[in-house]
Amino acid sequence: CPQILPSTQIYVPVGVVKPITLAARNLPQPQSGQRGYECLFHIPGSPARVTALRFNSSSLQCQNSSYSYEGNDVSDLPVNLSVVWNGNFVIDNPQNIQAHLYKCPALRESCGLCLKADPRFECGWCVAERRCSLRHHCAADTPASWMHARHGSSRCTDPKILKLSPETGPRQGGTRLTITGENLGLRFEDVRLGVRVGKVLCSPVESEYISAEQIVCEIGDASSVRAHDALVEVCVRDCSPHYRALSPKRFTFVTPTFYRVSPSRGPLSGGTWIGIEGSHLNAGSDVAVSVGGRPCSFSWRNSREIRCLTPPGQSPGSAPIIININRAQLTNPEVKYNYTEDPTILRIDPEWSINSGGTLLTVTGTNLATVREPRIRAKYGGIERENGCLVYNDTTMVCRAPSVANPVRSPPELGERPDELGFVMDNVRSLLVLNSTSFLYYPDPVLEPLSPTGLLELKPSSPLILKGRNLLPPAPGNSRLNYTVLIGSTPCTLTVSETQLLCEAPNLTGQHKVTVRAGGFEFSPGTLQVYSDSLLTLP
């Protein structure tokens, strides 16, 4: 089969008239009466069709033509190319050979960006016009007026520093300073010895250098330097005025300190979020915190606080905190973190709840207050839910039982143990699943609607009777399900039995929504219409 073969990459500058030669195989010789070859360039918005000349069975040339594409937000546009023979026969292009249309000025507003373009584009910096162009598009004629990266000595004037990050660092040095700008050299060698923060040398890191655009350097020790801030200087090869850049902002040498940790205690198993307060804590480029000689997992920091997750401790007692910010090591003997024995759970009362959870559970144990935000967790029928607990002291906390309601599995009338019940207390794994508990979940109360329509008329002073089942879970012990029945927003006095809630309706008239609550269970059986006595006594 006739096909186009890969040869050298095809680069076509926009607006320049030039032929394009393609390698091929088995190109048929057009017979008399047949149309010859054409090249189709599938340029978005402006496709081009150009006559082609067959040299022989293995070579073809798209004739002199110029090409263009819309906009200046794309510097290099790969364009699909088809070769057509005799009007409609498309020659195979199995390698999907493309033509690269390009514009030298697009996205290359600075000399550095221009000279770091692909050398095959033949783009260069037209000095007089301060723009990126092909050589013959640059009006000035002297060799020095058009710079190309191929000249090893090419160097852009007017380097600029646009951004420093970070803007502060410890005097001891080690901060990796990222300098973003333009014309910051073309090769690493151009800047290797040319970066300083005031009088302090900053050593560029070759692996992080981005030609012309970014230098990352490591700041040296500034302990002996008196100044507390300084301008950053970049010299490209030498420090003559045209090749020297000064930062618009000053870099500040600071002395980070810390003076408090909160909370100051937590379980031996770790996993406690702590905040270390101080000043200049966001200085430098790198931070590491250790508690008791083990790494505290860093989360975030600002100038006044560092947050991290405590590691497990070696033994109960106080543990020193050390913060390393680059080459600065911060310590404070006054600030210690205290590891306490892990909390334990001794009892949950009552040892049951309902499907929708929400019932109050009193949890007794030891060292409960060492955990800031304990949570109770239950897993049932594949779903896992958690609820927060309120800690009273080291031995008592109150939690609301998690809901386990789901359509696929619900507890039977005699109750069922959840798959798992436990507590999330920082990193204390032993409490995640309590094997010692015989905690049960019972079905929710089943309350019937007030009437088929949901509306019930009631005479004043008549009790409201709500019928249902599972109203009193058959749980051991004295605790019972605590109901609230609201008529509108007014609670009524309740008597609860196995099959009904008897509600002494408050002295109300008119229409009121009835709401029944028990733990996380909430149901409106309908609306109550209470007539006033005066309406009832009318003839």
Partner: antibody, heavy 117, light 112 residues
Framework: SLEESGGDLVKPGASLTLTCTAS?????????IYWVRQAPGKGLEWIAC???????AYYASWAKGRFTISKTSSTTVTLQMTSLTAADTATYFC????????????WGPGTLVTVSS | QMLTQTASPVSAAVGGTVTIKCQSS????????LSWYQQKPGQPPKLLIY???TLASGVSSRFKGSGSGTQFTLTISDVQCDDAATYYC?????????????FGGGTEVVVK
Amino acid sequence: SLEESGGDLVKPGASLTLTCTASGFSFSSNYWIYWVRQAPGKGLEWIACIYIGSDSAYYASWAKGRFTISKTSSTTVTLQMTSLTAADTATYFCARWDNSGRALKLWGPGTLVTVSS
Amino acid sequence: QMLTQTASPVSAAVGGTVTIKCQSSQSVADNNHLSWYQQKPGQPPKLLIYFASTLASGVSSRFKGSGSGTQFTLTISDVQCDDAATYYCLGNYDCGSADCHAFGGGTEVVVK
């Protein structure tokens, strides 16, 4: 019986709320009410369900974020749908879950939602 | 999770037997949480079988469900003209790990 309402012809990107109403009965507290949809000529697709005894709700993974199921009274459950696309064109059914059989026992006749520009 | 049903259409002669399979990509809850539904054009689905094999009230005993875990079958014996419809299986799964439910793609039964 159950009855759906609120189906309409809407433009892509629009929002719509469907209502499921219990007729001749009110929801008991242990009911789960479901929304299921069926695109023209296609199969059934579970969207979401809600427990009348609390606000526990579950969604199909594809429906999370764009669909919201809520109970609004003792006889109604709604399905709010946002950022509708042509792919949401379907008949939407509400149904009552049978707790004892773990199946959808009672179905409404459905309401048609058409999303088209 | 996914439920794959016997491809449509399935043809049967009056008085014959039709078998529709439903395969789940993972076990359904309690190994038997699968129900079968019949749907006729312009109508909502109707529950036929729940718990894989229990006949819903008012449904003809010609419909029989079987299977467990991931493989389930609906068998219609002594097929009648009125059985022409699309049949769907619905699987229930633990709601925590994935979606609570998934329908099969449906199997159309054509009665000749």
